[in-house]
């Protein structure tokens, strides 16, 4: 992190984003200060806002999983900022977390 | 040894209910989704159904919506296939299927489900 | 509903190429894997994320993905290649779709 408060997700997109123009995700956790655990998947290109999803989902788990056996991407991901994020929605905490892909990948 | 093995398949009459197991082992159960793929006899592979990590999010072939309900017992290392108002065309061998990402990694050996009068 | 198209037979001279298509409206945008199966056993993963090979599984095995079809290629074909090979894919729903199925058949 950067130091800056992170607007937290309180609510769930209803939409879903296609596997392959995701760049990678990062977690918000309510141990770190917000209110519901959410995964918000950063999308390849870097005008378009996060999309916050349900981390129970099954098709939040398949690209979880499909972007942890995916090598780290060379240039780190921005941490957590407050023109970054998607809802805004007044709450600030610091419930940002980033897994950009740090797991060993787990590919057959 | 990473390893599925499907089992409660049978001959069952149309409209009559079946519940298949998959017991899983050899790896950690709770961290992939599941799947059900049946493949009738000289035909092709069909997916029936998908659930995640927890059990929380399931979702279904249009074929079986309505009729099957899949589940998943974390503590037992066993996903389960509930199947309801069968019919001739459920037929088939019935394969669970490890998920990883975007494709099944492991499978078991399928149960054999007959349907007929 | 999506559907995936392949063709029922591809013929193939021992240690020769042979390529098996899969057909689906915008397959490209999804990640295709690809299955074998050989009489009386359970499938096998041969190719997943496209492109990328299971370990166990020849090099001779490789994939492509793009626009309206996925491609299986398998190089230096061996009568132990000889087998049904299908196709498959995840929508965003998400379910899945196999394709049809493709007998391969090593001649000589």
């Known amino acids: 992190s950067d130091g800056g408060a992170q607007d937290c997700c309180l609510k769930y997109s209803q939409r879903k984003i296609p596997a392959k123009v995701v760049r990678s995700y990062r977690k918000q956790e309510p141990s770190l200060g917000c209110s519901i655990p959410a995964i918000l998947f950063l999308p390849r290109k870097r005008s378009q806002a996060e999309l916050c999803a349900d981390p129970k989902e099954l098709w939040v788990q398949q690209l979880m999983q499909h972007l942890d056996k995916t090598p780290t991407p060379r240039k780190p991901v921005q941490g957590c900022r407050k023109d970054r994020g998607v809802p805004k929605n007044g709450k600030k905490g610091k419930g940002c977390k980033r897994t950009e892909q740090s797991q060993t990948p787990k590919g057959p | 040894e990473v390893q599925l093995l499907e089992s409660g398949g049978g001959l069952v009459q149309p409209g009559g209910s079946l519940r298949l197991s998959c017991a899983a082992s050899g790896f950690t159960f709770n961290s992939y989704s599941m799947s059900w793929v049946r493949q009738a006899p000289g035909k092709g592979l069909e997916w029936v159904s998908a659930i995640s990590m927890e059990g929380y999010s399931k979702s279904y072939a249009d074929s079986v919506k309505g009729r099957f309900t899949i589940s998943r017992d974390n503590s037992k290392n066993t996903l389960y296939l509930q199947m309801n108002s069968l019919r001739a065309e459920d037929t088939a061998v019935y394969y669970c299927?490890?998920?990883?990402?975007?494709?099944?990694?492991?499978w078991g050996q399928g149960t054999l489900v007959t349907v007929s009068s | 509903s999506y559907e995936l198209t392949q063709p029922l037979s591809v013929s193939v001279a021992l240690g020769q190429t042979a390529r098996i298509t899969c057909g689906g409206d915008?397959?490209?945008?999804?990640?295709a894997s690809w299955y074998q199966q050989k009489p009386g056993q359970a499938p096998v993963l041969v190719i997943y994320?496209?492109?990328e090979r299971p370990s166990g599984i020849p090099e001779r095995f490789s994939g492509s993905n793009s626009g309206n079809t996925a491609t299986l290629t398998i190089s230096r074909a061996q009568a132990g290649d000889e087998a049904d090979y299908y196709c498959g894919s995840w929508d965003s729903n998400p379910t899945h779709v196999f394709g049809g199925g493709t007998k391969l058949t090593v001649l000589g």
């Open positions: 994320d496209d492109n």
């Open positions: 915008s397959i490209g945008s999804q990640y």
């Open positions: 299927a490890r998920g990883y990402g975007y494709y099944f990694d492991v």
